[in-house]
């Protein structure tokens, strides 16, 4: 058992052992977004496919209403990629009165909602100015990091402009988390 | 043992325990690419260094002929970064007859090949329009996510244009996977 | 116990079992950078928040003086995102004598320092030309991969220009590592 002859000498905490195969895990993939209600003054949240194609949830990690529900406290690796596509940005137009225009931008935020907290917590943000000239453009923003989450926490992915999200392929825009 | 006094109360499945150090893992690094045949209508696959420098494969995860071979079914985190470099793109040149040009682009795809499937499965795609003006350009595309793989599956990294891949440094272009 | 009836038939190495909750882990977040000395011919290293907000270190993974200290040998997943922001780049100005200008660029390097090695090892590099026209710009570079590290190794994040790093939000610029 843990803490006996195999234990490293510096190991003094006898934590419960855990089979890796039963840890909460999810990989969600993009679906077409349609206009819906969102929290006011917050970027809109994406909704996701959770069981078809490459998408899955397992071991009590559930997806409901744009949220991944965390079933167990612990350290999770959370990731998302959102591919954006759009028209030529006007940010390179001649500046008026010598002032640079405010550039167009694209932003992805992975947000944690804890029912006992009044405000959502932004865990990860990827934000990029878009200043493409002469053509349509497309590009991904990727995010991923480890966070300590509590049972009952909810995760969502918010974007600055839902109209620009490329939902055409499950490998272009996705969201996932797994207990370490 | 698992399922005794240390087991969380919600834990009902008694999965086998597993030492982390013996899980299949690989980190492959870029080498100079030589022109090779590739499937028609499919982006060319990169080949990789698997044992020198930072590169390694371990615990039955093998690399052969551009493929990482999955030795054991389970959930894997798979990642890759490809750094591209190129000359000035012409996509921002003055548009002819007011039409935007189709942009140049760079694309990375992590692909799964299952022998019993006729078609490869695209797991991850990072694609970006390239519309740089006035100079040479360089930029990375990073991808990473978790997928359920089967023993015998093969993974490869495909790119839209092999001649644009920066193969000069092992830290710029790489590919890896590990069993969770 | 491991290696008994639950062990996969191909499993011949009886490695020590390990509770996941006691593995070394850290997620560090950006703080405002103050000018400091750095090694000649090496990009400056960022310093980090290690205990406030989303930041933490645990299980003997310590942060000191810009370095994450690796307390135990093994395979680690290491990641970082740095968000850069800057003024209009001049790289698209009219080329002199028909030569393209050398583009402005932004670079992030995750570096390993081993006391017994004279030179640091670059584990991961993300580098991007910046050629924005007509406005201020901002964009992230994300990196992440798995490496075999030794007890006593030190990790740091270096950037090409510390003055361009966006230190305003803990979700925009961060650095982490965890033992697999």
């Amino acid at each position: 058992l843990k803490g006996q002859e195999f234990a490293p000498s510096h190991q003094q905490v006898y934590a419960p052992l855990r089979a890796d195969g039963d840890k909460p895990r999810a990989h969600l993939t993009v679906v077409r977004q349609t206009p819906t209600q969102h929290f006011k003054n917050q970027f809109p949240a994406l909704h996701w496919e959770h069981e078809l194609g490459l998408a899955f949830t397992k071991n009590r990690m559930n997806y409901t209403n744009k949220f991944l529900l965390i079933p167990e406290s612990g350290d999770y690796f959370i990731y998302s990629q959102v591919t954006f596509r759009g028209m030529t940005s006007e940010c390179s137009e001649i500046r008026q009165a010598g002032r640079p225009n405010k550039p167009d931008s694209i932003t992805v935020v992975i947000t944690k909602v804890t029912d006992s907290y009044p405000e959502p917590t932004q865990l990860l943000m990827g934000t990029k100015s878009v200043c493409e000239v002469g053509s349509n453009w497309f590009q991904p923003i990727y995010l991923g990091a480890m966070f300590s989450l509590q049972e009952g926490d909810k995760l969502m992915v918010n974007v600055s402009d839902i109209s620009l999200v490329d939902y055409t392929k499950e490998d272009k825009t996705f969201f996932g988390a797994f207990l370490l | 043992l698992k399922g005794q006094e240390f087991a969380p109360s919600h834990q009902q499945v008694y999965a086998p325990l597993r030492a982390d150090g013996d899980k299949p893992r690989a980190h492959l690094t870029v080498v100079r690419q030589t022109p090779t045949q590739h499937f028609k209508n499919q982006f060319p696959a990169l080949h990789w260094e698997h044992e020198l420098g930072l590169a390694f494969t371990k615990n039955r995860m093998n690399y052969t002929n551009k493929f990482l071979l999955i030795p054991e079914s389970g959930d894997y985190f798979i990642y890759s970064q490809v750094t591209f470099r190129g000359m000035t793109s012409e996509c921002s040149e003055i548009r002819q007859a007011g039409r935007p040009n189709k942009p140049d682009s760079i694309t990375v795809v992590i692909t799964k090949v299952t022998d019993s499937y006729p078609e490869p499965t695209q797991l991850l795609m990072g694609t970006k329009s390239v519309c740089e003006v006035g100079s040479n350009w360089f930029q990375p595309i990073y991808l990473g996510a978790m997928f359920s793989l089967q023993e015998g599956d093969k993974l490869m990294v495909n790119v839209s244009d092999i001649s644009l891949v920066d193969y000069t440094k092992e830290d710029k272009t790489f590919f890896g996977a590990f069993l969770l | 116990l491991k290696g008994q009836e639950f062990a996969p038939s191909h499993q011949q190495v009886y490695a020590p079992l390990r509770a996941d909750g006691d593995k070394p882990r850290a997620h560090l977040t950006v703080v405002r950078q103050t000018p400091t000395q750095h090694f000649k011919n090496q990009f400056p290293a960022l310093h980090w928040e290690h205990e406030l907000g989303l930041a933490f270190t645990k299980n003997r993974m310590n942060y000191t003086n810009k370095f994450l200290l690796i307390p135990e040998s093994g395979d680690y997943f290491i990641y970082s995102q740095v968000t850069f922001r800057g003024m209009t780049s001049e790289c698209s100005e009219i080329r002199q004598a028909g030569r393209p200008n050398k583009p402005d660029s932004i670079t992030v390097v995750i570096t390993k320092v081993t006391d017994s090695y004279p030179e640091p090892t670059q584990l991961l590099m993300g580098t991007k030309s910046v050629c924005e026209v007509g406005s201020n710009w901002f964009q992230p570079i994300y990196l992440g991969a798995m490496f075999s590290l030794q007890e006593g190794d030190k990790l740091m994040v270096n950037v090409s220009d510390i003055s361009l790093v966006d230190y305003t939000k803990e979700d925009k610029t961060f650095f982490g590592a965890f033992l697999l």
Epitope: Q37, K40, F43, R85, K102, N136, D161, I162, L164, Y167 | - | -
Partner: antibody, heavy 119, light 106 residues
Framework: EVQLVESGGGLVQPGGSLKLSCAAS????????MNWVRQASGKGLEWVGG??????????QYAESVKGRFTISRDDSKNTAYLQMNSLKTEDTAVYYC??????????WGQGTTVTVSS | EIVLTQSPDFQSVTPKEKVTITCSAS?????MHWYQQKPDQSPKLWIY???NLASGVPSRFSGSGSGTDFTLTINSLEAEDAATYYC?????????FGQGTKLEIK
Amino acid sequence: EVQLVESGGGLVQPGGSLKLSCAASGFTFSNYWMNWVRQASGKGLEWVGGIRLKSNNYKTQYAESVKGRFTISRDDSKNTAYLQMNSLKTEDTAVYYCTPLLLSGMDYWGQGTTVTVSS
Amino acid sequence: EIVLTQSPDFQSVTPKEKVTITCSASSSVSYMHWYQQKPDQSPKLWIYDTSNLASGVPSRFSGSGSGTDFTLTINSLEAEDAATYYCFQESGYPFTFGQGTKLEIK
């Protein structure tokens, strides 16, 4: 349920002005681009113009046929988009629809409001 | 401006017949969308992103194409399909519609 209600149409003389409103409900209005599309009687659909989000400085785009005469605006606090039409011409006579745009087609349309430009 | 030209302008078809409507763009577009409109009704999104059927659209409809040439196909026409169909591009400003194709049931 998504609802779009256009109003403000009517009869106006050439050279005159009219302001159309589009009241939206059932979705978070501030998160979507809004567009105006028109259709003359017995004719095809014509995109008039659109307005983007606050984060894009409410950037607007217009069809060549209305550029300089029509102005699109929005009031996110009232969930309403507007089409200010000046220097109206007889060829502007049409049913005007508003619709939220995703770069994947326009799913939702109102019933439209009729504008007649005639002397 | 990207000009979209539909063909034919009008088609009279018998039920169960296969119908093909084409839309040609004056320059390359990323995706094409199709709308259906019946008399005295607002337009309805019918096919989006070239080949995806909007909610509630029967499977006898399909869309295809890329670049400058796109097609809407009805593989076995039914009476309820009588309507005008418009292609629409939003790959570049100004957004533009095709002139429409009116389908009539014989």
